[in-house]
């Protein structure tokens, strides 16, 4: 058993049939010594008396809010949550496995630049009685500070018969050094509580590996005289790190016909313009990627050829 | 070329070669995806790699003030990785794929380090980890780790030379 926060405790349980469970001793936070009784949740049934209560926690029915009273007055509360371990593996029932980039990916994170700011998100099908708490640091043995906000519900989607809820959180490294080569990964820890179930999820990454620039901005076409060719130009996204002579991007320009089956013409360039042939009913798209490190491409920015 | 006394390197040449190094480092080891290298206990060979850190003056302001600190750090790293790529970890069993660019990568690391430091001028270089051969089965994992680490190192070096070529070239 360990304390998650004031008056909230997590009991770690091996979850298999006929497991003996964990013996837990609760102590009433009071100077009083006698006349103390204990109840669980809203029930008025007295579970025991005395300054301490010893219970055997085996299942969710044994978890909940234990309250000690004296003469009708509440003295203190202890909320017991359960953390299940089945076959040596901690349960991951609350969050959905996003399976990208690999199985058992519950948290996904992205950064728009090298400033030390990043966003993480996760998915669940649970709509009520759900709380999240997020902590982060750079490195684990001698952690350096990363400040995370509160997790918020950022999207709701219908997937077949189920509703899926996306939560996200923004974090900022306290003393970020955008030009340095990271040697210690960022660690993100999410505590999830659904009713009386506790779970924790972690992710470890370098900012450089989660970079995904915003799409290029101000995408424009300029027809070239007496030619089917056009000059496409664009600019670095506002959110990208500066100066651009140091934090450089590379770009992919694609000409795509109306039909998805049509052959795509692609050009790669480090410049912020390119000359391409504009086919009728086609569209021109441009995306960006860090020039020197192969992290994710941005989403496409597109304009119609016409 | 960098010369004793701290005059400028051939920024444009260094830019071109460092960008080539980035391409080679990624073609030698595309994203592993299925292999999370951080889950595999860190071998000492990858613990001691020289990183370009915050105080090394490799940021745009530091380069403007005095690029020599940063160039020395990059040179140290190039020599370090050049030694590792020439070590038993890469030259031993199991065999690399026949068209592996590791040989080219090795040669390019040497080429860029020589651009930064001609013969006769010696910056202090970092101690190279023991090159005594690990057992063959451990090498694959070490190769992955070293190449991942090299990708991060050469990305910073390439940014430095690109910025230098754009803003510090005579």
């Amino acid at each position: 058993i360990w304390e998650l926060k004031k008056d909230v405790y997590v009991v770690e349980l091996d979850w298999y049939p006929d497991a003996p469970g964990e013996m837990v001793v609760l102590t009433c936070d009071t100077p009083e010594e006698d006349g103390i009784t204990w109840t669980l949740d809203q029930s008025s049934e007295v579970l025991g008396s005395g300054k301490t209560l010893t219970i055997q926690v085996k299942e969710f029915g044994d978890a909940g809010q234990y309250t000690c009273h004296k003469g009708g007055e509440v003295l203190s509360h202890s909320l017991l949550l359960l953390h299940k371990k089945e076959d040596g593996i901690w349960s991951t029932d609350i969050l959905k496995d996003q399976k990208e980039p690999k199985n058992k990916t519950f948290l996904r994170c992205e950064a728009k630049n090298y400033s030390g700011r990043f966003t993480c998100w996760w998915l669940t099908t649970i709509s009520t009685d759900l709380t999240f708490s997020v902590k982060s640091s750079r490195g684990s043995s001698d952690p350096q500070g990363v400040t995370c906000g509160a997790a918020t519900l950022s999207a709701e989607r219908v997937r077949g018969d189920n509703k899926e809820y996306e939560y996200s959180v923004e974090c900022q490294e306290d003393s970020a050094c955008p030009a340095a080569e990271e040697s210690l990964p960022i660690e993100v820890m999410v505590d999830a509580v659904h009713k009386l179930k506790y779970e924790n999820y972690t992710s470890s990454f370098f900012i450089r590996d989660i970079i995904k620039p915003d799409p290029p901005k101000n995408l424009q076409l300029k027809p070239l005289k007496n030619s089917r060719q056009v000059e496409v130009s664009w600019e670095y996204p506002d959110t990208w790190s500066t100066p651009h002579s140091y934090f450089s991007l590379t770009f992919c320009v694609q000409v795509q016909g109306k039909s998805k089956r049509e052959k795509k013409d692609r050009v790669f360039t480090d410049k912020t313009s390119a000359t391409v042939i504009c086919r009728k009913n086609a569209s021109i798209s441009v995306r960006a990627q860090d020039r020197y490190y192969s992290s994710s491409w941005s989403e496409w920015a597109s304009v119609p050829c016409s | 070329r960098a010369v004793p006394g701290g005059s400028s390197p051939a920024w444009t040449q260094c830019q071109q070669l460092s960008q080539k190094l980035c391409t080679l480092a990624w073609s030698a080891h595309p994203l592993v995806g299925h292999m999370d290298l951080r889950e595999e206990g860190d071998e000492e060979t990858t613990n001691d790699v020289p990183h370009i850190q915050c105080g090394d003056g490799c940021d745009p302001q530091g380069l403007r003030d005095n690029s020599q600190f940063c160039l020395q750090r990059i040179h140290q790293g190039l020599i370090f990785y050049e030694k590792l790529l020439g070590s038993d970890i890469f030259t031993g069993e199991p065999s690399l794929l026949p068209d592996s660019p590791v040989g080219q990568l090795h040669a390019s690391l040497l080429g860029l380090s020589q651009l930064l430091q001609p013969e006769g001028h010696h910056w202090e270089t970092q101690q190279i980890p023991s090159l005594s051969p690990s057992q063959p089965w451990q090498r694959l994992l070490l190769r992955f780790k070293i190449l991942r680490s090299l990708q991060a190192f050469v990305a910073v070096a390439a940014r430095v030379f690109a910025h230098g070529a754009a803003t510090l070239s005579p």
């Epitope: - | 292999m35 595999e40 020439g86 070590s87 038993d88 030259t91 031993g92 069993e93 199991p94 065999s95 590791v102 040989g103 090795h106 090159l131 005594s132 051969p133 057992q135 063959p136 089965w137 694959l140 994992l141």
Partner: antibody, heavy 114, light 112 residues
Framework: EFQLVQSGAEVKKPGASVKVSCKAS????????MNWVRQAPGQSLEWMGV????????TYNQKFKGRVTITVDQSASTAYMELSSLRSEDTAVYYC???????WGQGTLVTVSS | DIVMTQTPLSLPVTPGEPASISCRSS???????????LNWFLQKPGQSPQLLIY???TRASGVPDRFSGSGSGTDLTLKISRVEAEDVGVYYC?????????FGSGTKLEIK
Amino acid sequence: EFQLVQSGAEVKKPGASVKVSCKASGYSFTDHNMNWVRQAPGQSLEWMGVINPNYGTTTYNQKFKGRVTITVDQSASTAYMELSSLRSEDTAVYYCARRGFAYWGQGTLVTVSS
Amino acid sequence: DIVMTQTPLSLPVTPGEPASISCRSSKSLLYKDGKTYLNWFLQKPGQSPQLLIYLMSTRASGVPDRFSGSGSGTDLTLKISRVEAEDVGVYYCQQIAEYPFTFGSGTKLEIK
């Protein structure tokens, strides 16, 4: 094309030493370790040791207890295997094989006889 | 040292028939990178050994697809789906998981 060409057959007296060479061509010599393997008449193959041509670092089969020395001459793209204190049971064909064991020299017969 | 035990010692086969050679390792050659560090060679009379299979099951360049390698970390098998006259010679397994690299004692394949 890749080629490993070994020196010619040798006849040695017990107690003497022999030095076999293996000249590599068609690839970057320093990119690949060089192994040495021997085969006594009618017997299986026996790995003797390996050298990294970049640094000259070696790993030997302990069975040969300091009798074997593998070296390289980078400028000549050549690896050498020297075996000392020869005895009759060292009569064998000695092969060099590039890392990966896909490329082997043609073999050098060393006969130890009084 | 890892001991490689090869069976049978001799294998007479009729052309067109399949053949199977077994190799047992005293220690698993399967490591956490998912690879099994085992080679198979054929040595034809008067020639240097030629690599047939590496990493237990990958055919070397130019090797006909009638040759295949399989197995677990310790029990390895080389199969020839239809033996041809040119397949005669001595077959060896070799582990390259640990120094010193070791070979099996060899299996002599001959045509009946």
